[in-house]
């Protein structure tokens, strides 16, 4: 049944009285026929535009095959123009038309907002034949109407390639306000104003908006939808919602949490992944970001040596990945390491400090006073040096590495020898005669190989030409090594 029908014009009888015996042929006078005649004014028409149906279109009178009389103009009878009902109610509406029996194969289609309604719609057409005319009633019913059923419905009938269009029946489904825009969660700066938006629609309109903050009404006088609330600033987290009211009742939006941006929590679980003599690879688990994205982090490094001056080295790094290689550290040293990260509000506190150590380093200085002799009788080269003055951090000396390069016409080859830490001399076999031998020595610890000494060259003559004078590295301050032959 039609609920809450409100008509915009008086309805016409479903079946008018008997059709006039003699029909007017003057189309002009037809236009002024009283509506109670059962006919609507005749209008010349063009094809209906989608979405903008012509109202009261009629088929122009035609001459019968016998040519004796004209048929009346055809038009749908006027019916209720506007039906207002609540969501989930049922509605039924119809259009009716009386068609002379000379017309065959009349079909009625239903259209909504310019589109034909096909398929699973509840449309029923009933025919009531009489001597001269057949009354046709096309009914359309919707069960449990929804907002999507709102719109303008019309009937169309095709006769002899002419289209007859009914007046529209406007269906207005009313219900509780429906949100088209709800407030959204935000992270905001403390004591800084921000906006929230709420929009809801009917029908029925108007829709009035109340804002609620932490269950207290912000505006006792509602605003028409849409509404923008300027929140003057918060010092702590708050929950906001908006209430939309119309004549049907109230709908409440989702509650949204507005968080206050704060400095991050300190990182946790600082871990050591790898240590070398001069670097330590660390990782950490970031703390809570304080509702604001991390910008960068700071790795703080203190040397744990009672003799150190206690200064802190600071290394800045990106917030992601949560890993950093600390470089430029002393070998074989103990360090305390902490991490702090920042967002737009500020720096977190430093993580719990952890202890880490670097490993032994390679020596930082080369052996001193390298001297090279040619021992022709034994056909070898005698090499001597002095132990370098290595720092504690370099660790314990495990030996030396000797590099000797032999060069003669177009040929060059390098050989490496390892000798123990107790030695300060070594002998190497002559590889090539009539060639130059270049010797360099480096100290070796568990931490690696130190720098090589400056090269010392000695010429190895052909057999039988002897000179026992040594070649040696110069005393400190001399620019070039001395070569004695």
């Amino acid at each position: 049944a039609i609920t809450e029908a409100r008509e915009e014009a008086k309805p016409y009888p479903l079946f008018p009285g008997p059709l006039p015996g003699s029909l007017q042929t003057d189309h002009t006078s037809l236009l002024s026929l009283p509506h109670t005649s059962g006919y609507q004014p005749a209008l010349m028409f063009s094809p209906t535009q989608p979405g903008r149906p012509y109202t009261g279109n009629v088929a122009i009178p035609r001459v019968t095959s016998a040519g004796s009389k004209l048929l009346p103009p055809l038009a749908f009878k006027h019916t209720v123009g506007h039906i207002i009902l609540s969501e989930h109610k049922d509605v039924k509406f119809n259009c009716s038309i009386s068609v002379p029996n000379i017309y065959q194969d009349t079909t009625i289609s239903w259209w909504k907002d310019g589109k034909e309604l096909l398929g699973a719609h509840h449309a029923i057409t009933q025919f009531y034949p009489d001597d001269e005319v057949t009354a046709i009633i096309a009914s359309f019913s919707i069960t449990s109407v929804q907002r999507s059923d709102n719109g303008s419905y019309i009937c169309k009938m095709k006769i002899n390639n002419e289209e007859i269009v009914s007046d529209p029946i406007y269906i207005e489904v009313q219900g509780l306000p429906h949100f088209t825009k709800q407030p959204e969660s935000m992270n905001v700066t403390r004591n800084t104003a921000f906006n929230l938006t709420c929009q809801a629609v009917g029908p029925p309109e108007p829709v009035n908006i109340f804002w609620v903050q932490n269950s207290s009404r912000v505006n006792e006088q509602p605003e028409k939808s849409p509404s923008v609330l300027t929140v003057p600033g918060l010092t702590e987290m708050a929950v906001f919602s908006c209430e939309a009211h119309n004549d049907k009742g109230l709908t409440v939006s989702k509650g949204v949490q507005i968080n206050i941006k704060a400095i991050p929590s300190p990182p946790t679980e600082v871990s050591i992944h790898n240590s070398t003599a001069h670097s330590i690879l660390i990782s950490w688990v970031p703390g809570f970001d304080g509702y604001s994205p991390f910008r960068n982090c700071s790795v703080q490094v203190k040397e744990v040596d009672p003799l150190s001056n206690g200064s802190v080295m600071i290394f800045n790094t990106s917030a992601s990945p949560h890993m950093y290689q600390i470089k430029q550290l002393q070998a074989l040293a103990n360090y305390s390491i902490g991490v702090s990260c920042m967002n737009e509000i500020g720096w977190s506190a430093v993580s719990p400090w952890i202890l880490a150590s670097t490993t032994e380093g390679a020596p930082s200085v080369a052996p001193l006073n390298v001297t090279v002799f040619l021992n022709e009788s034994r056909d070898n080269v005698d090499i001597r040096w002095m132990k370098p003055l290595t720092k504690r951090q370099a660790g314990e000396l495990v030996g030396y590495r000797i590099s000797h390069v032999w060069q003669s016409a177009g040929i060059s080859k390098e050989l490496l020898e390892e000798v123990g830490q107790n030695n300060s001399r070594a002998q190497i076999s002559v590889q090539v005669h009539n060639a130059t031998c270049t010797v360099r020595i480096a100290a070796v610890t568990k931490g690696g190989v130190g720098p090589f000494s400056d090269p010392v060259k000695i010429f190895i003559p052909a057999h039988g030409w002897v000179d026992h004078a040594p070649s040696s590295t110069p005393a400190p301050g001399n620019a070039d090594p001395v070569l004695i032959i």
Partner: antibody, heavy 118, light 106 residues
Framework: QVQLVQSGSELKKPGASVKVSCKAS????????MSWVRQAPGQGLEWMGW????????TYTDDFKGRFVFSLDTSVSTAYLQISSLKAEDTAVYYC???????????WGQGTLVTVSS | EIVLTQSPATLSLSPGERATLSCRAS?????MHWYQQKPGQAPRLLIY???NLASGIPARFSGSGSGTDFTLTISRLEPEDFAVYYC?????????FGGGTKLEIK
Amino acid sequence: QVQLVQSGSELKKPGASVKVSCKASSYTFTTYGMSWVRQAPGQGLEWMGWINTDSGVPTYTDDFKGRFVFSLDTSVSTAYLQISSLKAEDTAVYYCARYTNYGVFDYWGQGTLVTVSS
Amino acid sequence: EIVLTQSPATLSLSPGERATLSCRASSSVGYMHWYQQKPGQAPRLLIYATSNLASGIPARFSGSGSGTDFTLTISRLEPEDFAVYYCQQWGSLPFTFGGGTKLEIK
């Protein structure tokens, strides 16, 4: 500049009635609620309640239910406070104040002194 | 209803000094507003929503606080600042005013 202009001082006898007006200008009257605040001589401020200028619905605080009536004439952007059965203790300055979000009274009338004395 | 207690009831200071006025609520409120009233005049909004300066109010006035404890501060008193100051809460109906603090010239 937003202005709230109140009617002049009134001297009334106990049992009589008084109607105080508050005319608003330079803003859309029906957009903001109108509050009424009482200040007895030498005392602090008491919120009496407010009227929805769009719907005309009044809201009274507990101490001001009964003899106090808020009303409107939106055609002239004016709010009214009527007090009936006046008592000596109703002697006070009555203020109208524009009522905005978060219960802020951002603009005030100059006040109307109502004196109830026999 | 929420009761607002303002302290001190009277504050005697000299121009140029700093004034700190307190307002304590009987239970937590959302925001506090502050008004200034001079003799024979209507109250005037100074600070709304705890810390926001109302239109036309000099920057020497500031507000702070949350929960139940709120403060109005006048950084450097001018002769025209000597008046009565009221706090008013938002968060629970009915909205209530404090009893006022009278700021007088020492």
